[in-house]
Interface confidence: medium
């Protein structure tokens, strides 16, 4: 999906609101410093694009994340504020559900929510340099 | 698969008030991000507002102040409590679970006086 037309003020403002603090309340317990940031985007696009894959891709040690209130909020805020979005991923959602799996949180998971928060935290600031 | 049934809507006068029922079967509210959106005649669908499972919400600028969406989880039951209701209001009401292709057939809602 090409996240190009989103509108990317109105994904901010969800962020800002809710989404940021369910990706606060995963951490909870966890140090800010305990992960390194290694996954970088480089305008709102490819953040939205990484924070689509990190979001909903399962990964090696982290399988659960997709039906985590952070997750839900996200795929909704991208479907409302990202045209087309939600018909790419009906096919892909209906597949989940009857797969669902159960909520587990891994080290993994942490350090790949880690990532995420970072993601955001850039998706915010469009206008930064690339360190 | 999740079923969604809309109820509530109705005529009704400038500034006044209604409330919007979304009856869910087949799955539970706890597990999902229930939203509302509206279509007016002609115009395309428009995201009203949503409410997490943890009773977190969100609503789009237009309705912010007037509208209040709330769950009731063990009835699987969400809400969308209408005031100060506008002409510009008017439009047929549709919940959805997560936006993902589970939509109610949509209850209509007309602001006439």
């Known amino acids: 999906y090409d996240f190009t037309n989103c509108d990317f003020e109105k994904i901010k403002a969800a962020y800002l609101s809710t989404i940021s603090k369910d990706l606060i309340t995963y951490m909870s317990g966890t140090k800010s410093t305990e992960f390194n940031n290694t996954v970088s985007c480089s305008n709102r696009p490819h953040c939205l694009t990484e924070i689509q894959s990190l979001t909903f891709n399962p990964t090696a040690g982290c399988a659960s994340l997709a039906k985590e209130m952070f997750a839900m909020k996200t795929k909704a805020a991208l479907a409302i504020w990202c045209p087309g979005y939600s018909e790419t991923q009906i096919n892909a959602t209906q597949a989940m559900k009857k797969r669902r799996k159960r909520k587990v949180t891994t080290n993994k998971c942490l350090e790949q929510v880690s990532q995420l928060q970072g993601l955001w935290r850039r998706f915010n600031r469009p206008l930064l340099k690339q360190q | 698969e999740v079923q969604l049934v809309e109820s509530g809507g109705g005529l009704v006068q400038p500034g006044g008030s209604l409330r919007l029922s979304c009856a869910a079967s087949g799955g539970t509210l706890d597990d999902y991000v229930m939203g509302w959106f509206r279509q007016a005649p002609g115009k395309e669908r428009e995201f009203v507002g949503f409410?997490?499972?943890?009773?977190?919400?969100l609503y789009a600028d237009s309705v912010k102040g007037r509208f209040t969406i709330s769950a009731d989880n063990s009835k699987n039951t969400a809400y969308l409590q209408m005031n100060s209701l506008k002409p510009e209001d008017t439009a047929v009401y549709y919940c959805?679970?997560?936006?993902?292709?589970?939509w109610g057939q949509g209850t209509l809602v007309t602001v006439s006086s």
């Open positions: 409410i997490g499972s943890d009773g977190s919400t």
């Open positions: 959805t679970t997560e936006w993902d292709g589970y």
